[in-house]
């Protein structure tokens, strides 16, 4: 008799999910040799412990703690580049800019990124038929509850200026629904980060609009200055220029706005 | 290139012991879990044994459990293999492999040595 298997609305599990999150642990601490102290076998354990046998609309942090011990790293605390909706560009910003780092930057956040995992309540099985989707099925599940968490504490380290890349052309440029809307923004420390820098990046060739006057980004700022944090927002007209530039900021191309 | 050397391999009587050593090269070896894996004479392939990178975690088939001890240097980039009690189903081809780790079905590997022959006899 086949078990009856809870069936939910988002994508199981990512194929050959334990050898990638391992291959990805050993990948990392190949490139960052101030990481090599890390077990990638006990990192795995730890994962492996926050999701399996449990039911994937019930993981709360304290399931992901024994991970984010496992998983400790002091990153270059005003050298954070946050996103929203925009994730290729900030990627490939920090890749050219190697001391600035996204949150997929860092161990964690290089195991998990564009993964999907979840269990069952009860067996040691992991989902590879689908999982729980945070808007039809629930908030509290496993992917969703381990992007907060590392999330904010990715956001609770960071000082100084702290950069935030934002999509121009979506409808909501900033959101207040998005991980950085919901959780970074409400996790920056007002006594270690004096400034948010917004760069909002746009994409049509001709946009010269300034979208820094955006009612959302009046809305980022009004959140942002109520938590006695400066505030400062730069139009990225070019995003193809910008890279360039950053790559070669001596091209004369580069001294007009981008 | 990735190489692993296994050696330490011979003729044994049953109930005695035999240290089996692999030394690796051409790959950063502390960043690797590592395992051995045996061929008996025949037969197919059976992983014996494996160890986390910085040697937290080890594993062990449940015929062998007790009886053998898996360790590693990473300052030497040497795995060894201690076997004791030894019996005539441990007679095989001793294999050094690298890889990924164990997921608690699968350990996933990556290169092999040549192995190392263990012949369990009286």
């Known amino acids: 008799v086949p078990r009856w298997r809870q069936q939910w609305s988002g994508p199981g599990t990512t194929k050959r999910f334990p050898e990638t999150v391992l291959a990805r642990c050993v990948k990392y601490t190949e490139i960052h040799p101030e990481m090599r102290h890390v077990d990638c076998q006990s990192v795995w354990d730890a994962f492996k412990g926050a999701f399996i046998s449990k039911h994937p609309c019930n993981i709360t942090e304290e399931d992901y703690q024994p991970l984010m011990k496992l998983g400790t790293q002091t990153v270059p605390c005003n050298k954070i580049l946050l996103w929203s909706r925009i994730k290729d560009l900030a990627h490939q910003f920090t890749q050219v800019q190697r001391d600035m780092f996204t949150l997929e930057d860092t161990l964690l956040g290089y195991l998990a990124d564009d993964l999907t995992w979840c269990g069952e309540f009860n067996t040691s099985k992991i989902n590879y038929q689908s999982c729980p989707d945070w808007r039809k099925d629930c908030s509290n599940n496993p992917v969703s509850v381990f992007w907060k968490t590392v999330s904010r504490r990715f956001a609770e380290a960071a000082c100084d200026v702290v950069h935030v890349m934002l999509n121009g052309s979506r409808s909501k440029i900033f959101d207040k629904n998005s991980t950085f809307g919901s959780v970074e923004v409400h996790n920056l420390q007002p006594e270690k980060v004096q400034t948010l820098e917004a760069w909002v990046i746009h994409g049509g060739r001709e946009d010269s609009r300034d979208l820094c006057q955006d009612p959302t980004i009046k809305e980022l700022e009004s959140i942002i200055s109520k938590r006695n944090i400066q505030f400062s927002c730069k139009n990225i007209y070019r995003p193809d220029k910008f890279l360039q530039c950053v790559k070669n900021p001596e091209d004369s191309s580069c001294t007009s706005e981008i | 290139e990735v190489q692993l050397l296994e050696s330490g391999g011979g003729l044994v009587q049953p109930g005695g012991s035999l240290r089996l050593s692999c030394t690796a090269s051409?790959?950063?070896?502390?960043?690797?879990?590592m395992s051995w894996v045996r061929q008996a004479p025949g037969k197919g392939l059976e992983w014996v044994s494996g160890?986390?990178?910085?040697?937290?975690?080890?594993y062990y088939a449940d015929n062998v459990k007790g009886r053998f001890i898996i360790s590693r240097d990473n300052s030497k980039n040497t795995l060894d293999l201690q076997m004791n009690s030894l019996r005539a189903e441990d007679t095989a081809v001793y294999y050094c492999?690298?890889?990924?780790?164990?997921?608690?079905?699968?350990?996933?590997?990556?290169?092999r040595g040549q192995g190392t022959l263990v012949t369990v006899s009286s």
């Open positions: 492999a690298s890889g990924k780790g164990w997921d608690g079905n699968t350990w996933y590997e990556d290169y």
């Open positions: 160890i986390s990178n910085r040697g937290v975690n080890t």
């Open positions: 051409g790959f950063i070896f502390s960043i690797y879990a």
